[in-house]
């Protein structure tokens, strides 16, 4: 029996929002599973030098390097990094093991390098070497999975040429529509590359790695379903594999399926058939049409015909380059304060897009849903009735698309006033943009009905934070109004709001707000 190491070296990855990561290098609370770095005795080294497995860390990630020594009693230690000594505070865990930790908060290039730890216990001395580097995510890729037929077997292999090596899973569903959403109980996931059960209603393959998750659906024509009102369309880029599945169920085995491209039967070797009996003893047949690497001349109408079902077609379009088709003209909306409203963008794209919604420099997750007509739609409803500019941005491998929206919230003006020695100003962010009136209050006009037209200057300005408009009106001080109360009023179709200002001397003014609907 070969000995396990006398010391244990572990890496603890802290989540970005982990408030448990302490500033000290002693012992932060840990919620994540520690990863064993397998500290092994370094060959050809004098003394007991242990070397931990190399540690690769994402930029800005927070980690703890930790060493456990199964020796109670006095332990002293010292960390050395780039010829500098760093503080080291050992402690003991519940099981009496000595624990030494080094916390690296928000990893940067300057924190990469060799960390040496010297430990001295009553029994022996140890030197432990950690090598920490920043993970080069520039080399990372995540490619959409594609299908291949397994050699000599009726099975599909799912392939995603990604770095790091992705985890591949099949996502299967046997019901229709909404119930096939990712987290639905009807959905079954199989973490394997090869799939033999190819009779399901909905078949997708997904690949995931550090960059995220990409999925490809097996394009299917179901002859037992009523055809869509518009012809289903499948886009592919030159060189990509084409896979279309035709599925049909019949009371007995007495029927056959065929594929045609533009009324010409597919060549041998471009299709294969499978059949099985379902639980109620009906026969299910599927016929795959496939081309391992498509060219422009593979474009056209692919029709699946059955001797017992009406035939159905799909339009396959082969493109040289990916695209995103949508109208990019900006759109303005005005809604009431409590009105339910969502922005939406309808687009046609290939390959599938990655998208974001942005408001006030903050990004929001973007969901997209396929429509029956080959278009997709992305909606954004989480605006919380904040007026301003909203941006939809989409991109795929070959194209980019940006669309601007302006949201205005209809509300009556709210007036804020300020004054200086030479002028008085009023501001309002009501919508529609308000109009302004200034009135002088005097003995002759105690109700402030005497209108002021001289020295008034109105403007609208863009409040930079949300891209929403603010209207302002400024009254330049004249001898005629000095020492008087003046009233500024902002009004729009939803109401009026006023502020009264005493024009005497500079400094804080008592403002009296009148709300007149």
């Amino acid at each position: 029996n070969q000995d396990l190491p006398v010391i244990k070296c572990v890496l603890i990855n802290h989540k970005n929002n982990d408030s448990s990561v302490g500033k000290s290098s002693s012992y932060p609370m840990v919620s994540e599973s520690p990863e064993d770095l397998g500290c092994a005795l370094r060959p050809q080294s004098s003394g007991t030098v242990y070397e931990a497995a190399a540690v690769e860390v994402d930029v800005s990630a927070s980690i703890t390097l930790q060493v456990l020594v199964d020796a109670p009693g006095n332990i002293s230690c010292l960390w050395v990094f780039k010829h500098s000594s760093l503080n080291c505070q050992p402690h003991f865990d519940l099981q009496n093991r000595g624990v030494v930790s080094m916390v690296i908060l928000k990893m940067t290039e300057t924190q990469a390098g060799e960390y040496l730890l010297f430990i001295q216990s009553e029994a022996t001395n140890y030197t432990i070497l950690f090598t920490v580097s920043i993970r080069n995510t520039l080399l990372y890729t995540l490619r959409r999975p594609y299908f291949r037929k397994m050699e000599n077997q009726d099975a599909l292999v799912c392939i995603s040429e990604s770095v790091p090596e992705p985890i591949v899973e099949w996502v299967l569903c046997d019901s229709q529509g909404e119930s096939c959403k990712e987290e639905s109980p009807a959905v079954v996931k199989k973490e394997e590359k090869v799939l033999h059960e190819l009779f399901g209603t909905d078949i997708r393959c997904c690949a995931r790695n550090e960059l995220g998750r990409e999925c490809t659906r097996l394009f299917t024509i179901d002859l037992n379903q009523t055809p869509q009102t518009t012809l289903p369309q499948l886009f592919l880029k030159v060189g990509e594999p084409l896979w279309i599945r035709c599925k049909a169920v019949h009371v007995n085995h007495g029927f056959g399926l065929t594929w045609e491209l533009e009324n010409k039967a597919l060549e041998e070797g471009n299709y294969f058939e499978m059949s099985t009996y379902s639980t109620n003893r009906t026969m299910i047949r599927i016929l795959f049409a496939f081309v391992s690497s498509v060219a422009r001349n593979d474009t056209g109408y692919y029709t699946c015909s059955s001797s017992k079902h009406p035939s159905q077609s799909a339009l396959v379009t082969i493109v040289e380059k990916g695209f995103i088709n949508a109208t990019n003209s900006s759109e303005d909306y005005e809604i009431d304060q409590y009105e339910e409203f969502c922005f939406s963008v309808r687009f046609k794209a290939y390959p599938q897009i990655r998208c974001t919604w942005t408001f006030s420099r903050k990004s929001f997750p973007c969901e997209q849903k396929g429509l029956d007509n080959g278009y997709s739609i992305s909606k954004f409803c989480n605006h919380k009735h904040q007026p301003g500019e909203y941006i939809f941005h989409a991109e795929n491998d070959d194209a980019q698309f940006t669309k601007m929206f302006t949201l205005n919230i209809r509300r009556k003006p709210q007036v804020l006033a300020e004054a200086s020695a030479s002028q008085a100003s009023c501001f309002s962010d009501g919508y529609p943009l308000p109009s302004w009136t200034w009135k002088k209050c005097s003995d002759k006009s105690p109700n402030c009905t005497e209108e002021i037209t001289e020295g008034v200057w109105n403007r609208k300005a863009n409040r930079k934070v949300f891209g929403q408009w603010v209207s302002s009106s400024t009254l330049n001080m004249s001898e005629a109004i000095k020492g008087f109360l003046v009233k500024c009023c902002a009004y729009n179709s939803l109401g009026t709001s006023c502020e009264t200002i005493l024009l005497n001397s500079p400094g804080p003014f008592p403002f009296i707000q009148d709300n007149i609907s």
Epitope: D3, P5, K8, V69, D70, A71, G73, E122, A123
Partner: antibody, heavy 118, light 106 residues
Framework: QVQLVQSGAEVKKPGASVKVSCKVS????????INWVRQAPGKGLEWMGN????????NYNENFKNRVTMTEDTSTDTAYMELSSLRSEDTAVYYC???????????WGQGTLVTVSS | EIVLTQSPATLSLSPGERATLSCSAS?????IHWYQQKPGQAPRLLIY???KLASGIPARFSGSGSGTDFTLTISSLEPEDFAVYYC?????????FGGGTKVEIK
């Protein structure tokens, strides 16, 4: 190679004490905890406590705290476990085992059968 | 103390079959370790830190799990694998062992 060799079987009367020894070889004695684990006939394993050789650090399982004493002699690389006030339910095989930093018992003695019978 | 419950108590299988042994902890533990014990012998360490194979242990033994539920799997039973298997934890101050699962020949 690492070896833990225990003393021979013992037969004791109820109320008596027994002292089992565990001599280690093949590694540096004060580098690892020595643990004592017992197993009653046909039953599971029960941890009794441990001792770190060369220090005065000992941990006892609460169930044995008042009856068990663990000692060691670094000059002979031997650990001892003494159990007093024996009763018939103490009849068991007593093992010494070495603990490592992974908190597992990687090497075991061959076991010492202690029979308590009147 | 953390109680480890092993199931089943006895598993009757034939050589070549797959054996799946469970170990359930009364509260969450960091790691589980597995031992094999044959009659008249001391236990032998099989797996440490839930899934790591101890030195000299054949690859047909594997461990998995997290939190409170752990599994030892023997992919294809060999005649020498018929024995009692114990799980052990040391997350708390004192270690505890499961009650054992006896894998016997059917």
């Amino acid at each position: 190679q690492v070896q833990l060799v225990q003393s021979g079987a013992e037969v004791k009367k109820p109320g008596a004490s027994v002292k089992v020894s565990c001599k280690v070889s093949g590694y540096t004695f004060p580098y690892y905890w020595i643990n004592w684990v017992r197993q009653a006939p046909g039953k599971g394993l029960e941890w009794m406590g441990n001792i770190y050789p060369g220090s005065s650090i000992i941990n006892y399982n609460e169930n044995f705290k008042n009856r068990v004493t663990m000692t060691e002699d670094t000059s002979t690389d031997t650990a001892y476990m003494e159990l007093s006030s024996l009763r018939s339910e103490d009849t068991a095989v007593y093992y010494c085992a070495r603990r490592n930093v992974y908190l597992t018992f990687d090497y075991w003695g061959q076991g010492t059968l202690v029979t308590v019978s009147s | 103390e953390i109680v480890l419950t092993q199931s089943p108590a006895t598993l009757s299988l034939s050589p070549g079959e797959r054996a799946t042994l469970s170990c359930s902890a009364s509260s969450s533990v960091s790691y589980i370790h597995w031992y094999q014990q044959k009659p008249g012998q001391a236990p032998r360490l099989l797996i440490y830190d839930t899934s790591k194979l101890a030195s000299g242990i054949p690859a047909r033994f594997s461990g998995s799990g997290s939190g409170t539920d752990f599994t030892l799997t023997i992919s294809s039973l060999e005649p020498e694998d018929f024995a009692v298997y114990y799980c052990q934890q040391w997350t708390s101050k004192s270690p505890t062992f499961g009650g054992g699962t006896k894998v016997e020949i059917k």
